[in-house]
């Protein structure tokens, strides 16, 4: 192999290793892949064709500021997808349409700072969606009932400052149980926001400037769910 | 199979009220697969679209910036319907107006009703 | 996705193939659906989500969608295929239906 990834057990290392394109000398069976530290501007999906195997793919800390759909046709396996800390700014319907097994995106440190549209609405086996240190000014991702299973939505250091509920009631048929909305400057909990999401678990407000009159009606508004 | 009737009046004064029903049959107003909306065709012009309704925990409604002071979109789910009332209307609204069922996920039009053409004038 | 521009008009002879554009910013970032229109009838969904045919849509109708275009494709095309075609897509920022100014397609 001329690439200078380490690889065992099907897994991949090809981190920290200053590469600027997806290795194509690696064994055709694995099933991780981890390119996290490199020099990585895009992700050619036919560079991904050989390791069609893939369960897990990890990216981070990289270059990237578009993703080709056509990404997760290659992948059909892909159930964990790590994006963190690169420089997507649009996430469009197509972005993950193919990506219908995940059930780990994690988004976080990117520069999203509005989800329009339905980007997650084929993502029916997620389970974490990681979001935070985003731009995202609320809390809305999407247009219609979607993210059935989804059990952990992590927005913290976001631009959020109210929770309303037509944002959160996409989660109706969902099973929310973790809502980590830490260090954003929330001043506005509307009425009936946490209807959709009443099985919460945990509600992390770290570094949350609340203060008596919105924590008053925070309670309140978690005793009506 | 989906089926979208269109009832209401074909003629209509300017400065009053447009009122169209639309009956569904085949599927539900209330699902959560589909949202529901207006659309009309001026005589020789294109499709322009007027606005849908559609239900997550509670009803929404998203109107085309050009009609949005006077247009209302509502469910009836006892009669399993939609209607669509169009204020202060003017001759420029004479069209012919189509109900429709916008599919998830992505909002194709996958089902019309048969239209009713609106005439506007004294 | 707040406008897209189709031809008024495109002619073709029978048989031949025809294909009718939809331009807009960035448009296949968008899934773009197509609709046919006969004179006095309702549009009929003809192409979805880029290139997907709903069921009793002839083979002959495909659809394509990348980079700032979107096109319609009618192979073989026949005289009842003779009709409007528009183009559509939504975003939920602006409007749920946008719509093209639609395209007349002659069979000569």
């Known amino acids: 192999s001329t690439t200078k990834c380490t690889v065992s057990h099907e897994v991949a290392d090809c981190s920290h290793l200053k590469l600027t394109q997806v290795p194509d000398d690696l064994p055709t069976n694995i099933t991780v892949l981890n390119l996290t530290h490199n020099q990585l501007r895009r992700l050619p999906a036919a560079n991904f064709t050989r390791y069609s195997q893939l369960t897990s793919l990890d990216v981070g800390f990289n270059t990237i500021s578009k993703l080709e759909p056509e990404l997760c046709q290659k992948l059909p396996m892909l159930k964990v997808l790590n994006l963190q800390h690169n420089e997507l700014s649009q996430l469009s319907d197509k972005t993950f349409a193919f990506c219908t097994n995940l059930t780990e995106l994690h988004l976080m440190s990117n520069s999203i700072q509005k989800i329009k549209n339905n980007p997650f609405v084929k993502q029916k086996n997620l389970i974490t969606l990681d979001l935070s240190h985003n731009g995202l000014s609320s809390t809305k991702l999407g247009t219609q009932v979607q993210l059935e299973n989804l059990q952990e939505l992590l927005l913290s250091n976001n631009k959020i400052q109210a929770l309303k509920s037509e944002e959160l009631d996409i989660f109706a048929n969902s099973s929310l149980k973790k809502l980590e909305l830490s260090s954003n400057q929330i001043k506005e909990f509307s009425p009936g926001c946490f209807h959709a999401i009443g099985r919460l678990f945990g509600l992390f407000l770290n570094n949350v400037q609340l203060g008596p009159s919105l924590t008053e009606k925070l309670c309140l508004e978690l005793a009506n769910t | 199979q989906v089926q979208l009737q269109q009832s209401g009046p074909g003629l209509v004064k300017p400065s009053q009220t447009l009122s169209l029903t639309c009956a569904i049959s085949?599927?539900?107003?209330?699902?959560?697969?589909?949202?529901w909306g207006w659309i009309r065709q001026s005589p020789g012009r294109g499709l322009e679209w007027l606005g849908i309704i559609q239900i997550r925990s509670k009803w929404y409604n998203d109107y085309a910036l050009s009609v949005k002071s006077r247009i209302t979109i509502n469910p009836d789910t006892s009669k399993n319907q939609f209607s669509l009332q169009l204020n202060s209307v003017t001759p420029e609204d004479t069209a012919v107006y189509y109900c429709a069922r916008y599919s998830y996920p992505f909002y194709s039009i996958d089902y019309w009703g048969q239209g009713t053409l609106v005439t506007v004038s004294s | 996705q707040s406008v897209l521009t189709q031809p008024p008009s495109v002619s073709v002879a029978p048989g031949q193939t025809a294909r009718i554009s939809c331009s807009g910013d960035n448009i296949g970032s968008y899934y773009v659906h197509w609709y046919q229109q006969k004179p006095g009838q309702a549009p009929v969904l003809v192409i979805y989500?880029?290139?997907e045919r709903p069921s009793g849509i002839p083979e002959r109708f495909s659809g394509s969608n990348s980079g700032n275009t979107a096109t319609l494709t009618i192979s073989g095309t026949q005289a009842e295929d003779e009709a409007d075609y528009y183009c559509q897509s939504y975003d939920s920022q602006f409007s749920f239906g946008v719509f093209g100014g639609g395209t007349k397609l002659t069979v000569l």
């Open positions: 989500e880029d290139s």
């Open positions: 085949g599927d539900s107003v209330s699902s959560n697969s589909a949202a």
